[in-house]
């Protein structure tokens, strides 16, 4: 038998520095976790102790902190090279800055193969990108060879900015011929490495003949065998074993997100390349693991530019941006409108002629807006200002909800109105009217939503049975501020871009902003 150790990360999202336990900014260093310096220590320790080790990343290194805002992917290439990753799969966020924003900083600079079998380039891009990413790569490991095939969420055109010259095919359809090709090359140990979410990972394990192991990402799935070491609740055992349609046992793994854990999977192959055992667990990268001094020094060197960036002007406001709790928790506030407009603008994707955009709606808990911005400072808006407004380091995500769920959410928004609670919703692409004289749970008297399947957007009454796309903070998607109905009833959830980054990009694009209070949220006569 031959043993392989697979070390894996996914959805690191720009967490190059150590973070707090909840993956936000590190405050108390003695209790911080993750970061590339600490990751390197653990990886090196395992490389020294074990003979056949692969370090793999399942995508979404891009997007998530000021590191990505400033360095735009150069930081990913630099530090992944330093850690000597063996392969990476493309995630949807790798396309956030367009194809150019992937090619120049990452594809051209990475010293490791970057993979995706289901992305096909066409037109002028085909020759430009040729060879910069691959469908698969055969890697020598010890005396053996291991094939790695990549895959990426076919939803990427709705989640990012890959442009019109990349076609995202069905993962299973695209993977099978590549795996077959590897088999004809006498490669009998094959890992599918990709970024389509846990459900698709399991489907690949079930349906793609010849795949021995699936290493996934996108859904931030935490798997663990035994008592979990931190706050994450396991979605299943690690590894998660799927029986394939042809009767093989295929381990499927993922390692949560944000570099908090290092996935650690030991696979035993027999002489024919069959997986005869697998075991392991994600390793919590807590402060008991020291940060590697040379990587840490490099991080500190790269950090300098970030501190300078924080105080640079992004754009100007010529109006007071009212982010006060007295406004945003009680009524429509122009800071809420600004943020929602930025959220929609960040999700403009013209992927279908029938739709002016795939999503038109935004909801945002008023309690998530933590500060106003005064225009009397020469109108200047900096990253630092925005970090005060949105200090939690969240993301603005895309969900699919039924109209009935949205109606429940808006009832929850005002179920205890008047107590300055955070659940009062700010909106975009929505007109809501509340009657506070009615009993809680029955206060929404009008709820109109902006059409998407239209050439001239207009507001139509919400339909209870229709499925709508909505942009909202990850906090709400996870049921925060009591929005349990969103968490319980959402039909799809894709994590999006860093909240501050979304707003800063919008302000930089607009140059001068002047958001108004314009009647998105109204109260019917006599009740307010």
């Amino acid at each position: 038998a031959w043993e392989l150790t697979i070390l894996h990360t996914n959805d690191v999202h720009s967490r190059l520095e150590q973070t707090s336990e909840d993956s936000s900014k590190c405050v108390n260093a003695s209790r911080c976790m993750g970061g590339v310096a600490r990751l390197f220590t653990k990886v090196q320790q395992i490389r020294r102790a074990e003979p056949n080790v692969l370090l793999l990343d399942a995508g979404d290194q891009y997007q998530g902190t000021i590191w990505f805002t400033v360095y735009k992917g150069a930081e990913v290439a630099h530090f992944m090279n330093a850690l000597r990753y063996d392969a990476m799969a493309l995630g949807n966020h790798e396309f956030d800055n367009g194809v150019e924003g992937l090619i120049e900083p990452l594809l051209k600079e990475a010293k490791f193969p970057i993979l995706s079998a289901n992305i096909k380039a066409k037109g002028p891009l085909a020759s430009q990108i040729s060879g910069l990413y691959l469908p698969y790569k055969v890697l020598p490991v010890g005396d053996e060879v291991v094939g790695i095939v990549g895959y990426t969420s076919k939803e990427t055109p709705f989640l990012s900015n890959p442009g019109t010259n990349l076609v995202f095919e069905d993962e299973i359809t695209a993977l099978q011929p590549e795996v077959d090709k590897l088999k004809t090359l006498n490669v009998n140990k094959i890992i599918a490495l990709g970024h389509s979410g846990f459900e698709m990972d399991k489907l690949i394990a079930q349906k793609v003949r010849g795949v021995d192991v699936v290493v996934g990402g996108h859904s931030n799935t935490f798997l663990y065998t035994g008592n979990p070491p931190s706050k994450e609740v396991p979605a299943g055992k690690y590894p998660f074993i799927v029986t394939s349609d042809d009767g093989r046992k295929v381990p499927v793994v993922q390692a949560y997100a944000f570099g908090k854990y290092l996935g650690y999977l030991k696979i035993e192959f027999d002489e024919r390349g069959n997986v005869i055992s697998s075991h392991g667990n994600p390793i919590l990268l807590n402060s008991s693991i020291p940060e590697d001094p040379s990587i840490k020094a490099d991080i500190n060197k790269w950090r300098i530019k970030l501190d300078n960036y924080s105080t640079q002007e992004l754009g100007k406001t010529i109006v007071y941006l009212d982010g006060s709790s007295q406004s945003c928790r009680f009524r429509e506030c122009n800071m809420g409108n600004l943020i929602c407009d930025a959220m929609i603008n960040n999700n403009l994707r013209h992927t279908d002629e029938m739709f002016w955009n795939h999503v038109s709606m935004c909801i945002l808990n008023g309690g998530g807006i933590r500060s106003p911005i005064d225009e009397r400072n020469n109108g200047t808006i900096t990253w630092e200002n925005l970090a005060a407004v949105l200090p939690f380091g969240g993301t603005f995500d895309l969900v699919q909800l039924k109209g009935s769920t949205l109606k429940k959410a808006f009832e929850h928004s005002v179920h205890r109105y008047g107590q300055s609670t955070g659940e009062f919703l700010q909106v975009g692409g929505i007109h809501v009217v509340y009657d506070l004289s009615r009993k809680p749970g029955d206060r929404v008297v009008k709820l109109d939503v902006l059409c998407t399947k239209c050439r001239v957007p207009s507001y139509d009454p919400l339909k209870m049975d229709e499925v709508y796309k909505v942009i909202l903070p990850n906090f709400l998607a996870n049921g925060g501020d009591g929005f349990q109905m969103i968490k319980d009833e959402l039909l799809r959830h894709d994590s999006g871009d860093q909240d501050i980054n979304v707003v800063s990009t919008y302000i930089s694009k607009m140059k001068v902003i002047y958001p108004a209070v314009e009647g998105r949220i109204k109260f019917s006569t006599g009740s307010h």
């Epitope: 055992k237 029986t243 009767g247 027999d270 024919r272 697998s278």
Partner: antibody, heavy 118, light 107 residues
């Protein structure tokens, strides 16, 4: 410890249907596959199919497709196998079994004898 | 479907004997073979999978070997509780198939 407890013996007439249950305990029901196996008196074992209660992924042996239906009730931690249009050759002991990572039929129920007789 | 053929169909032996049961697959099944023990009126019990991996709690006197199409189950020193019927099974591809069984009786 892992236990699979099957329903009691059944006597059915040809053309009727029978539903055999398999109640699981001692582990998380949704984490493992349940397999069904047929054994006619003095004959070899035959694999009927599997169900994965976690996402209700079901696979049948082509030979048993059509007349057998596998289901699972997560809340009751119970798997079921229904056989319809019974005939005399369906007289057999039916077993449910659970896998264990790299072992397929690792833990077995005690078996349910189904007798088809007019 | 892959056919699994066991030999012998029955076998008489004494306590302390070394016994070998063979199983032949109709096509290459790599090392994907399991062995089960069944006593009258009872459910089968898994002994070995992946040709030579003993299941939890199975005594070390049971061992397996082989590759491709030819496999053997060996009981190094028969104990009274080992008299039963033994089945091989291929888990190389669906449909999973079993051998016809080898009945091990007391001489």
């Amino acid at each position: 410890q892992v236990q699979l407890v099957q329903s009691g013996a059944e006597v059915k007439k040809p053309g009727a249907s029978v539903k055999v249950s398999c109640k699981a305990s001692g582990y998380t029901f949704t984490n493992y596959y349940i397999y069904w196996v047929k054994q006619r008196p003095g004959q070899r074992l035959e694999w009927i199919g599997w169900i994965y209660p976690g996402n209700l992924n079901i696979k049948y042996n082509e030979k048993f497709k059509g007349r057998s239906t596998l289901t699972a009730d997560k809340s009751a931690s119970t798997a079921y196998m229904e056989l319809s249009s019974l005939r005399s050759e369906d007289t057999a002991v039916y077993y449910c079994a659970r896998d264990d990572n790299y072992a397929w039929f690792a833990y077995w129920g005690q078996g349910t004898l189904v007798t088809v007789s007019s | 479907d892959i056919q699994m053929t066991q030999s012998p169909s029955s076998l008489s032996a004494s306590v302390g004997d070394r016994v070998t049961i063979t199983c032949k697959a109709s096509q290459d099944v790599s090392t994907a073979v399991a062995w089960y023990q069944q006593k009258p009126g009872k459910a089968p019990k898994l002994l070995i999978y992946w040709t030579n991996t003993r299941h939890t709690g199975v005594p070390s006197r049971f061992s397996g070997s082989g590759s491709g199409t030819d496999f053997t189950l060996t009981i190094s020193s028969l104990q009274p509780e080992d008299f039963a019927t033994y089945y091989c099974q291929q888990h190389y591809s669906t449909p999973f198939t079993f051998g016809q069984g080898t009945k091990l009786e007391i001489k």
